[in-house]
């Protein structure tokens, strides 16, 4: 004799996050009397999703009008799907009973898989700036995607990088996943305008990957090169000495002139010129009154760049009728605190 069967025709259903899932179920008979209930999962811990008899299920609507006579379609729609809704859904027929309805027959189950887009990748660089030739690490993170399969690539100025490590968590089954990747990048003096890009490709993105970027201008520090030169005599007993500060980044720089070790003037780089590579040049000059000196004068241009230990370059000014140009490097001198914030 034929007995009621509960038919769930779809073994699996794939839905994008935010959309509505339709879970199909039909019964072959109106008997026995009793409600259809939908559950996520099986066994004692199963979660009630819908009960035809009673309860309030705001996210669930029935495909057909269950009050209609002869209705045997118990399909439901679940709105605003999130990855947390993934699982196997069972359509279960209950038989009216006292004190409780009795489970009569279950459908085979429909596995609901949720496709969720990854969040926009967030790229973060090192906390402190680094100088050219150093290797720095960048991290890229993206969250909330499903299924687990995902592709992550790193680029520097359009060139794909190979030195990176990527993890997708968790390792086991989950409603959604996160990706974390760390790339190593070697800095060059030309990297002020460079960008590091993390690119994430996922089935939900339909071939249009998400990108996160980091500007190396936030990471790099290019120390300046110094050149001190003596200009021709501008007037009787006056010599113009210039200090060319070249190819530095960022702009934060303070320059101090010393005459024979004594501070003559301190100034902060302001009207700089920008090079094509994004670094800056700046020039400072000092007008020296030769007649005020009986002996030769040692002029030092001392530069503190971006809070780093000072670098300096000296020039020996001969007190004579016709001063000649000459310059000599000195070892870098630390003129004091790195804690000064002079912009």
């Amino acid at each position: 004799e034929e007995e009621l069967q509960v038919i769930q025709p779809d073994k699996s259903v794939l839905v994008a996050a935010g959309e509505t899932a339709t879970l199909r179920c039909t019964a072959t008979s109106l008997i026995p009397v009793g409600p259809i209930q939908w559950f996520r999962g099986a066994g004692p811990g199963r979660e009630l999703i819908y009960n035809q008899k009673e309860g309030h299920f705001p996210r669930v609507t029935t495909v057909s009008d269950l009050t209609k006579r002869n209705n045997m379609d118990f399909s439901i729609r679940i709105g605003n799907i999130t990855p947390a809704d993934a699982g196997t859904y069972y359509c279960v027929k209950f038989r009216k009973g006292s004190p409780d309805d009795v489970e009569f027959k279950s459908g085979a189950g429909t596995e609901l898989s949720v496709r969720a887009k990854p969040s926009a990748p967030v790229v973060s660089g090192p906390a402190a700036r680094a100088t050219p030739q150093h290797t720095v690490s960048f991290t890229c993170e993206s969250h909330g995607f499903s299924p687990r399969d995902i592709t992550l690539k790193w680029f520097k100025n359009g060139n794909e990088l190979s030195d990176f490590q990527t993890n997708v968590d968790p390792v086991g089954e989950s409603v959604s996943y996160s990706i974390h990747s760390t790339a190593k990048v070697v800095l060059t003096r030309e990297d002020v305008h460079s960008q590091v890009i993390c690119e994430v490709a996922h089935v939900t993105l339909q071939g249009d990957p998400l990108r996160g970027t980091a500007n190396l201008s936030e990471t790099i520090r290019v120390p300046p090169t110094l050149e001190v030169t003596q200009q021709p005599v501008r007037a009787e007993n006056q010599v113009n000495v210039t200090c060319q500060v070249r190819k530095f980044y960022p702009q934060r720089l303070q320059l101090t002139w010393l005459e024979n070790g004594n501070v003559s003037r301190t100034e902060t780089a302001s009207t700089v010129t920008e090079n094509k590579d994004g670094t800056y040049n700046w020039m400072s000059w000092l007008l020296v009154n030769v007649s005020a000196h009986r002996d030769d004068v040692k002029l030092t241009c001392q530069v503190e760049h971006d809070g780093q230990p000072a670098v300096s370059k000296s020039h020996d000014l001969k007190v004579s009728a016709h001063p000649k140009e000459q310059g000599s490097n000195t070892a870098a001198e630390n003129t004091g605190s790195n804690e000064r914030n002079i912009y």
Partner: antibody
């Protein structure tokens, strides 16, 4: 749906009433039996579905049995008494969201010695 | 077992008037809505009017309406017509599948 088999019987003589259906499948629908004694109200007897889904009101258990074929449903009054004199109706349905509808015209059973 | 008490036993109404019959269950019906209303005229089979407490059966005029939940239910006929003269029965279902019980009926006389 249409009932048949109603007649005059003596007390204790088993009587089988038949409900013949058309236009729907008995594998999908239950058939319920209701009676009305002369001058009284309607009284639910029971519902016949598949083998495991046949049930009778508590007062009717033991007094009635049910069976079915592909197009007919039988209600047997196992040992009629004069109190079983009534018009017997069969109807498609098993209550709640499957109410009794349509009904047959009824068949009269008279139990008398 | 479920007991359905129907009131009044009889009511008369003029054509165009309103008739109300009530049904009280001794305990909550199954799902709070296992209650149907039937119209029965002499020599005819009963006819389904309302099921699930308030759902109008196919082909039934909209002047018939059902309301209520749990233990208290009402059938209302608004704009009574002469053809509405009949006995009206409620049928309640308890938690046990065989626990289906008719009320005693309300005879409606149309003047």
């Amino acid at each position: 749906v249409e009932e048949s088999g109603g007649r005059l019987v003596t007390p204790g003589t088993p009587l089988t009433l038949t409900c013949t259906v058309s236009g729907f499948s008995l594998s999908s629908h239950g058939i319920s039996w209701v009676r009305q004694a002369p001058g009284k109200g309607l009284e639910y007897i029971g519902t016949i579905g598949t083998g495991v889904i046949t049930y009778f009101a508590s007062w009717a258990k033991g007094r009635f049995t049910g069976s079915k074929t592909s197009t007919t449903v039988d209600l047997k009054i196992t040992s009629p008494t004069t109190e079983d004199t009534a018009t017997y109706f069969c109807a498609r349905g098993s209550a709640w969201n499957d109410p009794f509808d349509p009904w047959g015209p009824g068949t009269l059973v008279t139990v008398s010695s | 077992a479920l007991v359905m008490t129907q009131t009044p036993a009889s009511v008369s109404a003029a054509v165009g008037g309103t008739v109300t019959t009530k049904c009280q269950a001794s305990q909550s019906v199954y799902g709070n809505n296992d209650l149907a209303w039937y119209q029965h005229k002499p020599g005819q089979p009963p006819k389904l009017l309302i099921y699930l407490a308030s759902t109008l059966a196919t082909g039934v005029p909209s002047r018939f309406s059902g309301s209520g939940s749990g233990t208290q239910f009402t059938l209302t006929i608004t704009g009574v017509q002469s053809d509405d003269a009949a006995t009206y029965y409620c049928l309640g279902g308890g938690d046990d599948e065989a626990d289906n019980v008719f009320g005693g009926g309300t005879e409606v006389v149309v003047k």
